[in-house]
Interface confidence: low
């Protein structure tokens, strides 16, 4: 299709060389009028269409993205040629930074509903370059933590080297929705709730004598609780004896709850005590069976191919530990009678 009629937008992505940061492009098609995508040709000069960076219309969730090769080759379908770029509805997600992401990206509706829609497309010229001002690297991270229940703020990484006074107007989005109230380089959160977690995008316009372009940064915000002050607790086994049948296989599960820790390094293991001897058992890997903001439940099983008489004299001990301390629970096997 002919892209000469596409509206054009220039964007700059200055990425931090030490972050696996992400980037997004929105299909900034003009707001659909009624059931159509856009009728730019029908508008009088005074009727400027409102741009919606994230389309609210269901129609607009179905757009096609292309990249325009610099050598003049035909447009390439993003989904076929670029595994590190993912399309999600109207948004194009770049999973890895790099100057090789520079180029022209075109989006248009998949379904053309009227002859006027043929020229309904947006061409985004993306320039990608590494952050060269090393001191600016230190200002705001592309991953930011907010503590639940307290105050906090989300800073726009590309603007954090500037003072609030000299900062230009910023457009913020959260999980694809325009945050129309926010215009400064920091979003101040009076009280942090779990819904503040998400992907934030901040845009501002930069101009020189020739042209203007949008500088964009993406911030992943996670809401966290304070580090636990408790050692982990063992949820299972509860009893210290377990009835078993000799000669049969047996699996004993150890489930433990670990409170949130910023640096999470849980230990969960089984060992066997036999009179004066004690040794750790090689058992299957631990697995997380439930994870919430406040804690995580981890399970690890010990598997006996068949219970022997010797096993009845042993104690099977589950040991769990975090940075605060450790907890143990021992199980003695007892032969089932009758």
């Amino acid at each position: 299709f002919n892209i000469s009629g596409c509206s054009t937008k220039k964007l700059l992505w200055t990425y931090s060389t030490r972050s696996e940061e992400e980037f997004v492009l929105f299909c900034d098609l003009p707001e659909p009028q009624k059931s159509h995508f856009c009728h730019r040709n029908r508008l009088s000069p005074k009727q400027v269409p409102e741009h919606l960076p994230f389309m609210g219309s269901n129609d607009l969730s179905d757009v096609q993205w292309y990249q325009q090769p610099s050598n003049g080759d035909p447009l390439e379908d993003i989904r076929k040629s670029y595994p590190h770029i993912i399309q999600d509805k109207c948004t194009l997600h770049f999973l890895t930074p790099g100057v090789n992401n520079s180029g022209s990206y075109i989006c248009r509706p998949k379904m053309i509903k009227s002859p006027y829609d043929v020229a309904c497309c947006v061409k985004m010229i993306l320039e990608v370059k590494p952050q060269t001002n090393a001191s600016c690297e230190y200002s705001a991270s592309h991953k930011q933590d907010l503590l639940l229940g307290s105050t906090g703020s989300i800073s726009c990484p590309s603007l954090s080297c500037q003072s609030d006074a000299q900062s230009p107007a910023v457009t913020w989005y959260k999980n694809g929705k325009l945050l129309s109230v926010e215009r400064s380089n920091r979003i101040v959160v009076d009280e942090v709730y779990d819904y503040h977690q998400g992907t934030y995008v901040c845009d501002y316009t930069q101009s020189d004598t020739v042209s203007s372009w949008t500088v964009r940064a993406v911030v992943q915000v996670r809401t966290i609780v304070g580090d636990t002050k408790l050692k982990p607790d063992i949820l299972d086994p509860v009893e210290d004896t377990l009835e078993v049948e000799l000669g049969k296989p047996l699996t004993i599960s150890c489930k433990a709850r670990f409170g949130f820790e910023r640096v999470f390094n849980p230990v969960i293991k089984w060992y066997i005590k036999d009179s004066d001897l004690e040794w750790e058992v090689s058992v299957p890997e631990a697995k997380s069976i439930k994870s919430t903001l406040k804690d995580e439940i981890i399970e690890r099983n010990i598997i006996l191919e068949k219970v022997t008489q010797r096993d009845l004299r042993r104690k099977f001990v589950c040991f769990v530990q975090n940075s605060i301390g450790n907890t143990t629970q021992s199980v003695q096997l007892k032969e089932k009678r009758g």
Partner: antibody, heavy 124, light 107 residues
């Protein structure tokens, strides 16, 4: 550009409390973890503890009974108090920022910005 | 606490030499290791994170490798400004610990 500046008395008497403040300029104290580290003369680095902007703390067990780290977000400052000092606490004290570097599925923390350090001598 | 042992404690080398400093952890720390450079009278400067990722602005002659318990910092061709003390630091579990340092001197 974020900069850190330690301040406080350079001389403290034995058994007294050492008090230092770190002022953060060029950026907000919010959303970050802030650490204190010390270095006795001619020796290596020892992590004392960190504080999150909200006030959550984590201390080195070897110093835990004597350490208090606090934060004042309105002043963009965080502070260290070390009680019952002895000559062994003589050191250069540094404040630093712990920044989360975004690895794919987790955060990897390093101390990326440091103050220039302040020398504290414990002597009568 | 996880102990980090650096070797050698000090070494003498000349400009242009290739030098390697090792850091061994008392238990596995995955790749949660950073390297810092410290010059006399100055604060440490962060060089490498996650065992092998180079901080922005750090010359490419510096490289890190390793995972688990054994890590190395290599300077491929020493420059005059590289003579300093180097520390490794683990962030795998609390308390955060540093190696005792390796002093790199001019031969």
């Amino acid at each position: 550009q974020v900069q850190l500046q330690e301040s406080g008395p350079g001389l403290v008497k034995p058994s007294e409390t050492l008090s230092l403040t770190c002022t953060v300029s060029g950026g907000s104290i919010n959303n970050y973890y802030w650490s204190w580290i010390r270095q006795p003369p001619g020796k290596g680095l020892e992590w004392i503890g960190y504080i999150f902007y909200s006030g959550t703390t984590n201390y080195n067990p070897s110093l835990k009974s004597r350490v208090t780290i606090s934060v004042d977000t309105s002043k963009n400052q965080f502070s260290l108090k070390l009680s019952s000092v002895t000559a062994a606490d003589t050191a250069v004290y540094y404040c630093a920022r712990d920044v989360g570097i975004a690895a794919r599925n987790s955060y990897y923390y390093v101390m990326d910005v440091w103050g220039q350090g302040t020398t504290v001598t414990v002597s009568s | 606490a996880i102990q980090l042992t650096q070797s050698p404690s000090s070494l003498s080398a000349s400009v242009g030499d290739r030098v390697t400093i090792t850091c061994r952890a008392s238990q596995g720390i995955s790749s949660a290791l950073a390297w810092y450079q410290q010059k006399p009278g100055k604060a440490p400067k962060f060089l490498i994170y996650e065992g092998s990722s180079l901080e922005s602005g750090v010359p490419s002659r510096f490289s890190g490798s390793g995972s688990g318990t054994d890590f190395t910092l290599t300077i491929s061709s020493l420059q005059p400004e590289d003579f300093a003390t180097y520390y490794c630091q683990q962030f795998n579990s609390y308390p955060i610990t540093f190696g005792q340092g390796t002093r790199l001197e001019i031969k």
